[in-house]
Amino acid sequence: LNTTILTPNGNEDTTADFFLTTMPTDSLSVSTLPLPEVQCFVFNVEYMNCTWNSSSEPQPTNLTLHYWYKNSDNDKVQKCSHYLFSEEITSGCQLQKKEIHLYQTFVVQLQDPREPRRQATQMLKLQNLVIPWAPENLTLHKLSESQLELNWNNRFLNHCLEHLVQYRTDWDHSWTEQSVDYRHKFSLPSVDGQKRYTFRVRSRFNPLCGSAQHWSEWSHPIHWGSNTSKENPFLFALEA
């Protein structure tokens, strides 16, 4: 049985192979039970965690993980050398930087060691699964009386990242957001000096070096402007 799994991680060609034993008519064989899906994320191209929901197993099972790279020099099957655990049961595998090869098809195989025929294989494009660290060192510069420029740093090559800037004043119900490309500069042309502004940024490994859908965590916020701004009309509404 060859089943295509559609996952929300940009790996449209992900496939899983489930190897089944013959199913007895009177009972369900253990080897017919589907294995949990493996989810992998590459953190800042420093390490990768491939995890699965170990609690989905009918009984506690130390599933094993093997991996290789399809059609490449790295096509030798490798055993996981650093398992992650949840309540003393394997629930993931951590791979170090030297084991991560973006742009080659990563094949990951989960197996039940007690039922070797019970295994599932997935193929992943790791460049679509990179999550960078959150932007750091946010700074604001006043370009003119009413114009602010926001700058920040990333712990990755700038040209591989795109960014989302959000800002709001103490008067706003919701954030205003703007996409920013690899140049990672944002300016706000019209700033009200009577209001206090909050800015935050997140980054994504897209579109140059990968096609990741997942954003980094938000940066720590940075603030600008009057702490003693005019009374917030929404506060009055809440207090009324």
Partner: nanobody, 117 residues
Framework: QVQLQESGGGSVQAGGSLRLSCAAS????????MTWARQAPGKGLEWVST????????AYAASVEGRFTISRDNAKSTLYLQLNSLKTEDTAMYYC??????????PGQGTQVTVSS
């Protein structure tokens, strides 16, 4: 093994143009972003430009933006860099490299660009 062969460099007057090429082999060229970098005499390696694997996205160092254009032909496994409005400060050895330009793997042999005033 991975092979990258740059060509197209030369000597040119300021304001002139050149087109650099990089012929790649030994890997799945169309799967990788590709990068141009350069090294001026007595200086470190400087990132110049990167292009996505499908050619749909590009990025440039501020010092070359608007003057240089990166492109690729996946059918020919070849990377290009069009250099226009050359300045004396563009004088350097130009290298192409597989990937996004993180310094690994090492680039090819390079092609020399010399711009005189």
């Amino acid at each position: 093994q991975v092979q990258l062969q740059e060509s197209g460099g030369g000597s040119v007057q300021a304001g002139g143009s050149l087109r650099l090429s990089c012929a790649a082999s030994g890997f799945s060229f169309s799967s990788y972003p590709m990068t141009w970098a350069r090294q001026a005499p007595g200086k470190g390696l400087e990132w110049v430009s990167t292009i996505a694997s499908d050619g749909g996205s590009t990025a440039y160092a501020a010092s070359v933006e608007g003057r240089f254009t990166i492109s690729r032909d996946n059918a020919k496994s070849t990377l290009y860099l069009q250099l226009n409005s050359l300045k004396t400060e563009d004088t350097a050895m130009y290298y192409c490299t597989k990937g996004y330009g993180d310094g690994t793997p090492a680039p090819g042999q390079g092609t020399q660009v010399t711009v005189s005033s």
